[in-house]
Each structure stands twice: as structure tokens, then as C-alpha cells.
């Protein structure tokens, strides 16, 4: 099925034309625009960026673009009373001090309101105390410290690579771990590749670069003080004692440079293995403590964050469709960022802008999509997605019964190797149709399509001739469309080929140096990977918003839905006894996908069949598919996340930037030798399976003929 | 119940290879390190090197300059140590060892004789 | 490589004295230091680790302590069953090594 019928307008207008408008030099121009000055949440000059895009959106032909603010928890360095750590000696006086701040970038020495390095929610706090590395903070290192090198991190301080998962989850760890404080730190064997200059020469980190981000575990709540509800003029607002997802001790990222002063002076036990050294030239020993002569020596953190309601601004554009005006396809994407925000987020920015031109171009001559498509730049990401959660919240019954897709537009860029899609299954063959059709920007690759360069650059590692596509996780602005309500989402960038460094970003991600010259000089000079990124995510929305049969495939979530099962079934196996002993079975898991399996291919068969020029037998068919994954929603939530309900996907426990797939099961399997009361546990086990068995079947049944 | 259980007893010739197994058993293999200890007649325990299951890195004593290799296969939860051009003082007990540093869990060991 | 070395080799004791073993590294291994017991014929079984913390189910009457170089493992009140050869390690620097055992009889 193609989006080449017009809707009130001549044949001209098809995804053609919408992709032959987009063009590179108005990415580059608008990358430029975004980029000159800091826009951090809660700013006055990201609240004048939103009016500016409000505006420019206007003008490029939307419907209406309207501001929605909400007063969300921020938080902040205290501007008079830095933030730093120091090594103390035994009489308490400060023998070194971590930097204040990062040197800035060469033209950008005058630039005012850089914030220092910070980590975003960390509480007020001066704990001093010995040091324990305890390599990336995952559950894994924690373990091997806790219980192969009994390494007890009570009362410590620990210091952690950033790197593998993300940082709130690293903090987490830290806390349940009984430490006093955390200090995260970038190593170069994460951050900086070898071969490569640091900036401004190249794109490595340099020593005094660091990492800003925020360090919560909101499990999908947004706003941490009134979860589940918008905050708005009359929100009531949870006391800070109640508030969500805030760490319980002291936080702060520290470069290189400064890690090389904390850690050559650790003692203590030799690392497990090689896997917990860096690069630095350091024994990368474990602690806990200084070493000889430095054992009196301590670690002190001096950190006087403060967090404050905010006011936050998302712009919201329409462009309202022409024969199903309810449906919406959505294209959102954060404006707000650390520093400058040269490539987070502001390469995805600037791609939006881009897009919104083009749809608006197009208007202009006459076109309207068939649905409606919105367009957000969401407030406050990097606070913990608040603005695009705020929005969803406020908006959550529209979006329920009205949303067909989100598309997300964060970084277009990670990396200049290959393209790297996200999805839910349904969107599968969507983005295998569109690359196909798209031509590769990649070098040795001319003349050929994106579809055939991504394959060959990024394989499926279960489907040969088939590129990589991964499952969603979170740490961006399509979790709450995704995990909350269930509506269809998926993102594209241009990504690096450094698979084993999946989830470290690159080196100088939330740092001062991701400027627009890091872009223009080092990481896509002619802009083509940002046009490439451009036509995927625009030709996504073109198409989802404008197909008369919506592009969806239910077939390949059965196909998954098999793969997961098996995925799970085998984890579980690895306690064929206890299995026995407690009947635990996953008959009515693998029936279940069985019958789905059987379901969505019958529905496939009548989907090629059905009379399409009957507009509510077309409205039909179409609501069944819009709807397929929102059945994948529990109401009830998963354990102790309630905001997260989706039974097929949940960003990890361990690491949120990833994506587990039949979460529930998951986590109720892990570590699941070491739980007091095996019983429980194994009950727990088969209730997760009875509620994704059920789950599944109910998802089935959506797909069956109505009557 | 945790068990590791190593391989046979061997006798090998001057400059031939050896290579000792130990299956891991009640408790997921990927968790923990495997060390390989040696203790010769009448010796000291020494260290050899260890591998993590999970990535598959080895880490070796230098002292064995390239003569011992470590490795693993998951799906079988086993991990193999083998120690190539063998020499008569290389006779000892070989032990696999869980841990990270520490020596908790012990394989029963596997006598390796060198004589010509 | 930071060498490990026990004293005395072997000692003779009667049930129920105080026995002390002691151990010297030849560089600062700062508390990383663990003993075990290897009875004849077994395998090494580990006492105590960090220097002075005893290893699950490991009797009271094991006690050790030190830092920097130099360490103790102490037997309070030996018992026939402490008849063994006791090794400390050092785990602060790779390579890990051992000292050279001390090997406990009974008078």
C-alpha cells in the first residue's frame, strides 16, 4: 500500500515531493539558530526558543501551534556556593579540589549561563569517607563486589565509571548498596576513541569535559511531585519527602582529570578482571580506601544543588487532517539542553524544524494529510522527560482514543556509520519500505539504498538480508506515549559502529563541547546523515499520517512475541528443579502466542481483502490496528512501576536506557536463587506469566473478526 | 547445590598440551569469575588466571608467558584451562577456583603429570 | 610480583594453645589479605578475608589481623582438626600470590 493517493489535492503532492523538499542546508542553518546560547529548562532563553520556533511554525503553515506550560521539580547548581569534591588529609584540610567548571570551547569563553557539571536532583550534602570503585555501578558489579570480593560499600563513598546504563540507575545501585555518596566519573576507555583528537581537534572528550544528566528513577512517573497528573495551575503537589524517583544521597561528575587524582591513590582489592579497568594509568584497584602512605587520606563531596518548580514550556503545532481529523500522528522532539546542545537535541531539533517546513510548504499548495499530524518540542528531558510526560498526562484520554503513532526526534546523530531504528514491531515494515526507497548517504554506498547500506552495516542478528531493529527502552520522550498508553512509537538516528559501547553515547554527550562546530567540522560537514535522518522520520509521519490502511504489520509482533517467549522460557530453565517443584509452566504463554500468531495472520488476509472504498469497514480495520498496542497495556501496571504498562516491553530494571521484553516475568526470574522465601518467589514468577499469557490472548482477540 | 567438577587425572609428555575442564553447577556460570590454581608437590598455590564467563575475557599471570590459555563455553557452564609446552616442573594439582580475588569455592582438583 | 612469605614453615603445638602464624609481603597490599586451611588430601578452604574477617561457618576461635605488610592468623585454642597447612594470599596487586604455607601439627 502506498501514501501516494492525494487527499483533496493533485496526484503531485505525494511523499515525493514532501521528501524532495527537505533539504540539507536548512538543518544545517537551523542546527546553527539553535545552538548559540545555552537552553536549559526552566530559562528564560529556552522559554524565548519555544516562542521562536512557536512562531517560525506559524509561519511555515501549521493550523496552530500553541504553548503548554506546566510547573515541574528542576533543579539546579547554586550559583554562589559551587559544587566540587576534594581529597582531605587527617587533619580535614583540603589537599585537592575537582574543577569548578569545564574550560570552555574556543569562541565561546563569553558565552554567560553555561551551567558547572552538575548531577540533576542530587540533595544537598557534605559526606566525607574512604572510596570504593565499583567499575559501571551496575546490579552485575555490585554483586561481584558484595559477594565474590565482599567489598562492603556501606558508609562509602563510590566512584563509577559513567557508561553501559544509565546513570539514575547506577545511583540507584549505589543507595540499596548502603553508600554515602557517588561520584561518576568518564573514562577514556569509554570516551574516548583511540585514534581520534579531543576537541576542539576532534571529538573525544578532553580531561576537563564532563557529563551533566539528570540522576532519578522515575519509572515513567514525570513530574516527581504530582505523578500520574498533569502540573498545572490547581496540580496538588506531593511534599519532597514523597516526591518521586529523588536520590537519597549526593551525586556529582567529575572529567578525567579529576578521576586520575581520586583513583591512583586507591588500595584495597585488585580489580576482579580486565573488564573493570579503563585507560587511565591507574591500578584501578577497588578500595575500600587510599593506599600506604594515603590510608588516612578521605573523600569529602560538597554539593549544594537545589531543586525548584519550574515553569516549562512544550510547543505544540497542528496540522489537522483531512478525512480522519482524530487520529493523531505524532512527531516530538526536546528543545531544552545542558549547554549549547550541538548535537542533544538540537540535531533532532533542527530535523523537526525541517520537516515542519516541508508539511507546511506542502499545505500551502493545497494538501492536508489524511490524519492529523501533531508536532511537539517538548520542555525539560533532560529532567526526566517531564515536559513531553506533563503533556501526555494532560492529554491522556485524546491520546487513548486518538493516537495512532509517535515518532520520536531527539539527537539525529550519534555517530556518522549507520542508520539505528527503535520500534514497536508494528512499524517493522513500515521502515523496511521507506529505507528501501531512500538512498543511502553512506560512502561506498552511492547510488545504492539506505535499506541495502543499514543491512549491510547493521544486520539482524536473527534475519539474514535484514537490518538491526531494536526494542524500545527509555531515557527519551516516546516513553510515555509507548510504556503509559501504548500507542505505537518508534525513533531513527544515524548511529556509530561501536556495538559493545551501545549505551555510553558519545564522548562528548552532555558536555560544553557538544557545539554546532562539533557537527559541522567532525561529525556531518555536508548535513547528509541529517537529511537521511530527515526523510526517515519525516517519511514515517508522511506515511502513518496519509496511508489509507494504516502501515502497520501485526504479523511481526507474533513473530516476536515467539522469540520473546522462547527468551524467557530458557532463563527460566536455567532452574529446571525448582520448576518442577513449584509446577511452573508456560503452556499458557506459548498458546497464547500460538493463537496470536494464528489471529494476526487470518486478520492479515482479510486486511489485503477488505473493501477499502467502505469508509467504516476501512475505519474499522484501521481502529484494530491503532489499537493492537495499546491492548498490550495492563492497567494495573508492572510491580512497584505503575507508570509503566506495557507487558510486552518495560525499559529495564537495570538499566533504563534498554529495552526487556516480557518484563514482568523478567524480573521476577532475576536473581531469583538468591531471594529468602523461594516459594514467593516462584508464585511471583507464575502470576507474571498467567498476566502476560492473558495479556497476549486479549491482544489476539482485538485482531479477530468483530463479529 | 553449588558444585564445580573438574576433569580426569593426566599424564602427559615434555612440549604436549593439557587441557582441564570444570563444569560449574547450581548457580548461573555468567555471575562469577573462574580462577585456575595450581599447587605442584609439596608447593605453594600459585595463580595462574582467571576469565569472566560473561565477556569471555581472560586475564594470566605472566609468569606463564603465553603457555596457558582460558576459556569457556556458556551454554555447557564449563570453563577449560589449557597449559601448552609442558615441562616436569609443571606437574601439580590443578584446581578451578570461584571468585573475584577471593577463593571461596574450589573445583576437586586435577592431577597433571609431565614425564617423559 | 609482590612476594608472600609465611613464618615459621611448619610449627608443632598441643590441643588447646595459641598458635600464630604470621605473614610479610614485600609491598603494601593494605588489608587485601585472605588465609585458608588445606587439610591433606583436600582442597584449600577459605578462613578469612580483608585481613580479620572470618569466612562464613568458620570457627571463632580463627582470628586474623595486620595491614600493610604484615599479618597474623591466629588459632586461639587449637583443636585436632586444625591439623592443615595454612596459606595467606595477597589480592591488592596482580598477580595474586601465596606465601609458601605453613604446615600445623599436633604435639
Known amino acids: 500500500k502506498s501514501s501516494n493517493e492525494a487527499t483533496n489535492i493533485t496526484p503531485k503532492h505525494n511523499m515525493k515531493a514532501f521528501l524532495d523538499e527537505l533539504k540539507a542546508e536548512n538543518i544545517k542553518k537551523f542546527l546553527y539558530n539553535f545552538t548559540q546560547i545555552p537552553h536549559l529548562a526552566g530559562t528564560e532563553q529556552n522559554f524565548q526558543l519555544a516562542k521562536q520556533i512557536q512562531s517560525q511554525w506559524k509561519e511555515f503553515g501549521l493550523d496552530s501551534v500553541e504553548l503548554a506550560h506546566y510547573d515541574v521539580l528542576l533543579s539546579y547548581p547554586n550559583k554562589t556556593h559551587p559544587n566540587y569534591i576534594s581529597i582531605i588529609n587527617e587533619d580535614g584540610n583540603e589537599i585537592f579540589n575537582t574543577s569548578l567548571f569545564e574550560p570552555p570551547p574556543p569562541g565561546y569563553e563569553n558565552v554567560s549561563d553555561i551551567v558547572p557539571p552538575f548531577s540533576a536532583f542530587s540533595p544537598q550534602g557534605m559526606p566525607e569517607g574512604d572510596l570504593v570503585y565499583v567499575n559501571y555501578a551496575r546490579t552485575e558489579d555490585f554483586f561481584k563486589l558484595e559477594r565474590d570480593m565482599k567489598i562492603n560499600c556501606s558508609g562509602k563513598i563510590v566512584i563509577a565509571r559513567y557508561g553501559k546504563v544509565f546513570r539514575g540507575n547506577k545511583v540507584k545501585n549505589a543507595q540499596l548498596a548502603g553508600a554515602k555518596g557517588v561520584i561518576l566519573y568518564s573514562d577514556p576507555a569509554d570516551y574516548f576513541a583511540p585514534g581520534v583528537k579531543s576537541y576542539p581537534d576532534g571529538w573525544n572528550l578532553p580531561g576537563g569535559g564532563v557529563q551533566r544528566g539528570n540522576i532519578l528513577n522515575l519509572n515513567g512517573a514525570g513530574d516527581p511531585l504530582t505523578p500520574g497528573y498533569p502540573a498545572n495551575e490547581y496540580a496538588y503537589r506531593r511534599g519532597i519527602a514523597e516526591a518521586v524517583g529523588l536520590p537519597s544521597i549526593p551525586v556529582h561528575p567529575i572529567g578525567y582529570y579529576d578521576a586520575q587524582k581520586l583513583l591512583e591513590k586507591m588500595g584495597g582489592s585488585a580489580p576482579p578482571d580486565s573488564s573493570w579497568r579503563g585507560s587511565l594509568k591507574v591500578p584501578y584497584n577497588v578500595g575500600p580506601g587510599f593506599t600506604g602512605n594515603f590510608s588516612t587520606q578521605k573523600v569529602k563531596m560538597h554539593i549544594h544543588s537545589t531543586n525548584e518548580v519550574t515553569r516549562i514550556y512544550n510547543v505544540i503545532g497542528t496540522l489537522r487532517g483531512a478525512v480522519e481529523p482524530d487520529r493523531y500522528v505524532i512527531l516530538g522532539g526536546h528543545r531544552d539542553s545542558w549547554v549549547f546542545g550541538g548535537i542533544d537535541p538540537q540535531s533532532g531539533a533542527a530535523v523537526v524544524h525541517e520537516i515542519v517546513r516541508s508539511f507546511g510548504t506542502l499545505k500551502k499548495e493545497g494538501w492536508r494529510p489524511r490524519r492529523t499530524i501533531l508536532f511537539a518540542s517538548w520542555d525539560a528531558e533532560e529532567f526526566g522527560l517531564l515536559g513531553s510526560t506533563e503533556w501526555a498526562e494532560e492529554n491522556s484520554r485524546l491520546l487513548q482514543e486518538r493516537g495512532v503513532a509517535y515518532i520520536n526526534a531527539d539527537s539525529s546523530i550519534e555517530g556518522n556509520y549507520t542508520l539505528r531504528v527503535d520500534c514497536t514491531p508494528l512499524m517493522y515494515s513500515l521502515v523496511h519500505n521507506l529505507t528501501k526507497e531512500l538512498k543511502s548517504p553512506d560512502e561506498g554506498f552511492e547510488g545504492k539504498s539506505l535499506y541495502e547500506s543499514w543491512t549491510k552495516k547493521s544486520p539482524s542478528p536473527e534475519f539474514s538480508g535484514m537490518p538491526r531493529i531494536s526494542k524500545l527502552g527509555s531515557g527519551n520522550d516516546f516513553e510515555v506515549f509507548f510504556q503509559r498508553l501504548g500507542i505505537a512509537s518508534g525513533r531513527a538516528r544515524y548511529t556509530k559502529n561501536w556495538e559493545t559501547n551501545k549505551f555510553s553515547g558519545y564522548p562528548l554527550y552532555h558536555s560544553v563541547y557538544e557545539t554546532y562546530e562539533l557537527v559541522e567540522k567532525f561529525y556531518d560537514p555536508m548535513f547528509k546523515y541529517h537529511l537521511t535522518v530527515a526523510q526517515v522520520r519525516g517519511g514515517m509521519v508522511f506515511e502513518l499520517a496519509n496511508s489509507i490502511v494504516l502501515p502497520f504489520d501485526c504479523r511481526d509482533y507474533a513473530v516476536v512475541l515467539r522469540k520473546y517467549a522462547d527468551k524467557i522460557y530458557s532463563i527460566s530453565m536455567k532452574h529446571p528443579q525448582e520448576m518442577k517443584t513449584y509446577s511452573v509452566s508456560f503452556d499458557s504463554l506459548f498458546s497464547a502466542v500460538k493463537n496470536f500468531t494464528e489471529i494476526a495472520s487470518k486478520f492479515s488476509e482479510r486486511l489485503q481483502d477488505f473493501d477499502k472504498s467502505n469508509p467504516i469497514v476501512l475505519r474499522m480495520m484501521n481502529d484494530q490496528l491503532m489499537f493492537l498496542e495499546r491492548a498490550f497495556i495492563d492497567p494495573l501496571g508492572l510491580p512497584d512501576r505503575p507508570f509503566y504498562r506495557h507487558v510486552i516491553y518495560a525499559p529495564s530494571s537495570h538499566n533504563k536506557y534498554a529495552g526487556e521484553s516480557f518484563p514482568g516475568i523478567y524480573d521476577a526470574l532475576f536473581d531469583i536463587e538468591s531471594k529468602v522465601d523461594p516459594s514467593k518467589a516462584w508464585g511471583e514468577v507464575k502470576r507474571q506469566i498467567y498476566v502476560a499469557a492473558f495479556t497476549v490472548q486479549a491482544a489476539a482477540e482485538t485482531l479477530s473478526e468483530v463479529a | 547445590e553449588f558444585q564445580l567438577v573438574q576433569s580426569g587425572a593426566e599424564v602427559k609428555k615434555p612440549g604436549a598440551s593439557v587441557k582441564v575442564s570444570c563444569k560449574a553447577s547450581?548457580?548461573?556460570?555468567?555471575?562469577?569469575?573462574m580462577n585456575w590454581v595450581r599447587q605442584a608437590p609439596g608447593q605453594r598455590l600459585e595463580w595462574m588466571g582467571l576469565i569472566n564467563p560473561n565477556y569471555g575475557t581472560a586475564d594470566y599471570n605472566q609468569k606463564f608467558k603465553g603457555r596457558v590459555t582460558i576459556t569457556r563455553d556458556t551454554s555447557a557452564s564449563t570453563a577449560y584451562m589449557e597449559l601448552s609446552s609442558l615441562r616436569s616442573e609443571d606437574t601439580a594439582v590443578y584446581y578451578c577456583?570461584?571468585?573475584?580475588?577471593?577463593?571461596?569455592?574450589w573445583g576437586q582438583g586435577t592431577l597433571v603429570t609431565v614425564s617423559s | 610480583d609482590i612476594q608472600m612469605t609465611q613464618s615459621p614453615s611448619s610449627l608443632s603445638a598441643s590441643v588447646g594453645d595459641r598458635v600464630t602464624i604470621t605473614c610479610k609481603a614485600s609491598q603494601g597490599v593494605d588489608t587485601a589479605v585472605a588465609w585458608y586451611q588445606q587439610k591433606p588430601g583436600k582442597v584449600p578452604k577459605l578462613l578469612i578475608y580483608w585481613a580479620s574477617t572470618r569466612h562464613t561457618g568458620v570457627p571463632s576461635r580463627f582470628s586474623g589481623s595486620g595491614s600493610g605488610t604484615d599479618f597474623t592468623l591466629t588459632i586461639s585454642s587449637l583443636q585436632p582438626e586444625d591439623v592443615a597447612t595454612y596459606y595467606c594470599?595477597?589480592?591488592?596487586?596482580?598477580?595474586?600470590?601465596f606465601g609458601q604455607g605453613t604446615k600445623l601439627e599436633i604435639k
Open positions: 594470599q595477597q589480592y591488592s596487586r596482580y598477580p595474586l600470590t
Open positions: 577456583a570461584r571468585g573475584s580475588s577471593l577463593f571461596a569455592y
Open positions: 547450581g548457580y548461573t556460570f555468567t555471575d562469577h569469575n
